[in-house]
């Protein structure tokens, strides 16, 4: 109770009090004062005595304490996806009697919904409210409405107003949780078949058979088979085990295999599921494409006088394919190339780079040409080798060794002699010259014998015809 | 309409062999696979194996291999199964069907 | 090879009643689960293919759900003539199986 100072200027003083007057109370004189937060409601009981007839006992004294912030209080909830649910009590709650009950309280909307609305019951749908009356709430007009699309939660926050009273709740955030619905259909973006090997088994890449959903998994959308008019499908790691369906993940492991038989065109007709949808009536080719195999025939040996150029022909090299291809489009092409000479076009400056790809038509044409390179020492016979690899796409490469035999053994036009060297001699008229190992050298008749053992043979000439006009 | 008519009851002696048709009719042959069942009596239904009518690869169940061969002749539209060396326990009912859907009538086995 | 569990092995219901057969797979089969009917001396009658479609000519009473390894036919409201043996039939992968069957009796 406030009572005065005893002096004019001393300041009323706040003292506790068990009993107080009528005047009390209409001088203002009587306070409550709250002192326990969050306990908004308080009560306390009097006996009320005039001195006339008898006193009035336990009169209840209710008092509600305005709390400084309206309390609102917010549930969070759970939605459908692209469904309503709406905002009514215990969901949205002012506590206590007194807020409610005022015909000012509104709700503000600090921060809308951002993959909703919050709309009332009856009024236009087109976008969400800034505001609305705790009335409305009541009325159970004021709903939450999702907006369909692939979200898993969404929020909003609130204000609840008091405008007489200049009083306001702090902002109270609901969280709002979306429950998935499959509503989108499964939707097949490419089709493009299957081109592979007549008997091979290959993988259908993701690449030739793909589907979306906007609202499952690669591992939810499922295709489903009937027979296959020219094969089987089989998973990577069973290829016994035949199945009618597998699944976008699948296809993209690169675990779906088809395993061609029977005819060259042919596939299978499927539909596509997410569980919830079916996509029938679709077909995915398949085409196999006969092997087309490469073979080499012709000696792959070619024989070579010392120091001279010989053309490579079809006794040596001939390429043929099954599909009886072109000779111009069987490609060869040197991997490692000659180490006693080289490989030379006939129509191409021969001083150039080494030969990397011919042509099997440029075989049967003569004009590859192997070129011997005479070496210093002198030799016998010598063997080199072409290491090649035959190509015509599709088949396969095949790869093929051309052995080269050197040898002063085989006849040479070229080259009458089969010695190392025999140059003959100039000699001026009725004088004599010397016969020297430049001019005359058979020492390589002696190449076959080990270096250490060579100075215990000696070659020997033997003259079978004397010069005619001279002597030795 | 859609037919599967499959050949009559048979009487054999273990060690004979039997051939079983099924003549389809209705639709188009090489489209949907033919399958074959065994229906043994106080016994449940058991698939035996099938064949893809369209590249005649025919596949079997684990309990029938060897003995059993499914085979087809495209131009008459009709897949066989044929049973060697017949013995008591291959008593049963044999029933063809082609895309879950459509049945044969049955084909009574008698081994004895 | 995949194994299918048909339960109960025997039902015994009355006129009206609904019931739920049962069948589970070893491992995924896709929604590949046909259900058929079988009555004596008779070809099996496909009520249901890839788990839950309908199948025309056969009564709305028979329905199918389930997806993964789970599966289950409802019969709405019972009716003596549905007294047979129910199979389930994986087609999903080679070699096929069926399941043991449900034998439904009507009270």
């Known amino acids: 109770m406030v009572s005065r100072g005893a002096l004019a200027d001393e300041p009323p003083s706040l003292d506790p009090v068990q009993s107080f007057s009528q005047e009390a109370v209409d001088t203002g004189r009587v306070l409550y004062l709250h002192s326990r937060p969050e306990a908004w409601s308080d009560a306390f009981s009097l006996d009320v005595a005039s001195g006339l007839g008898a006193p009035l006992e336990g009169v209840l004294v209710e008092l509600e304490v305005l709390p400084a912030a309206i309390p609102l209080e917010a549930q969070n909830f759970s939605v459908p996806e692209g469904g309503s649910l709406t905002l009514a009590p215990p969901l949205l709650r002012v506590s206590g009697p007194y807020f409610p009950t005022l015909l000012g309280l509104s709700l503000q909307v600090l921060e809308p919904p951002q993959h909703g609305a919050l709309q009332k019951e009856d009024g236009p749908q087109a976008r969400t409210l800034s505001a609305f009356s705790w009335r409305m709430v009541e009325e159970q007009l004021i709903r939450y409405v999702h907006d369909g699309s692939e979200t898993l939660t969404d929020s909003f926050v609130l204000m609840a107003n008091a405008s007489e009273m200049d009083r306001q709740s702090h902002p109270v955030a609901f969280t709002v949780t979306v429950l998935p619905v499959n509503d989108q259909p499964p939707i097949l973006t490419t089709n493009t078949g299957l081109q592979m090997w007549e008997g091979a088994t290959a993988p259908i890449p993701a690449e030739a058979l793909r589907s979306t959903d906007g609202d499952s998994g690669s591992e939810d959308l499922v295709y489903t088979i009937e027979q296959p008019s020219n094969g089987r499908v089989v998973l990577r790691g069973a290829p016994g085990t035949e199945v009618r369906s597998f699944t976008q993940a699948q296809l993209d492991g690169g675990l779906v295999l088809f395993s061609h038989r029977g005819t060259l065109d042919g596939g299978f007709r499927f539909r596509l599921s997410d569980g919830e949808h079916t996509s029938p009536g679709h077909f995915f080719r398949v085409t196999a494409q006969k092997q087309v195999l490469l073979s080499l025939k012709g000696s792959q040996t070619l024989t070579v006088c010392p120091g001279s150029v010989q053309p490579l022909s079809s006794q040596t090299l001939r390429a043929s394919s099954s599909a009886g291809t072109d000779p111009q489009l069987l490609l060869y092409r040197v991997v490692r190339g000659p180490q006693l000479g080289r490989l030379f076009h006939a129509q191409q400056d021969s001083t150039g780079e080494a030969l990397v790809n011919f042509t099997q038509a440029e075989v049967y044409a003569g004009n590859i040409l192997y070129e011997h390179e005479m070496p210093p020492e002198p030799f016998w016979e010598a063997h080199d080798t072409l290491e090649l690899q035959l190509s015509s796409p599709p088949a396969r490469d095949v790869a093929a060794t051309l052995a080269v035999a050197v040898s002063f053994e085989a006849a040479c036009p070229q080259r009458p002699s089969h010695l190392w060297k025999n140059k003959g001699l100039w000699v001026p008229e009725g004088q004599r010259a010397r016969i020297t190992v430049a001019a005359l050298d058979a020492s390589n008749l002696l190449a076959s014998v080990p270096s250490p053992q060579r100075s215990e043979h000696d070659v020997l000439f033997q003259v079978t015809q004397f010069p005619s006009r001279g002597q030795l | 309409q859609i037919q599967l008519v499959q050949s009559g009851p048979e009487l054999k002696k273990p060690g004979e062999t039997v051939k079983i048709s099924c003549k389809a009719s209705?639709?188009?042959?090489?489209?949907?696979?033919m399958h074959w069942v065994k229906k043994t009596p106080g016994k449940g239904l058991k698939w035996l194996g099938w064949i893809n009518t369209a590249t005649g690869e025919p596949t079997y169940a684990d309990d029938f291999k060897g003995r059993f061969a499914i085979s087809l002749e495209t131009s008459a539209r009709t897949v066989y199964l044929q049973i060697n060396n017949l013995r008591n326990e291959d008593t049963a009912t044999y029933f063809c069907?082609?895309?879950?859907?459509?049945w044969g009538q049955g084909t009574t086995l008698t081994v004895s | 090879d995949i194994k299918l569990s048909q339960s109960p092995s025997i039902l015994s219901v009355t006129p009206g009643e609904t019931v739920s057969l049962s069948c589970r797979a070893s491992q995924t089969i896709y929604k590949n689960l046909h259900w058929y009917q079988q009555k004596s001396h008779r070809s099996p009658r496909l009520l249901i293919k890839y788990g839950s479609d309908s199948i025309s000519g056969i009564p709305s009473r028979f329905t199918g759900s389930g997806s993964g390894t789970d599966y289950t036919l409802n019969i709405n409201s019972v009716k003596p003539e549905d007294e047979g043996i129910y199979y389930c039939?994986?087609?999903?992968?080679?070699?096929?199986?069926f399941g043991g069957g449900t034998k439904l009796e009507i009270k």
């Open positions: 039939l994986q087609g999903y992968s080679t070699p096929w199986t």
């Open positions: 069907f082609s895309y879950y859907d459509y």
């Open positions: 209705g639709y188009t042959f090489t489209d949907y696979s």
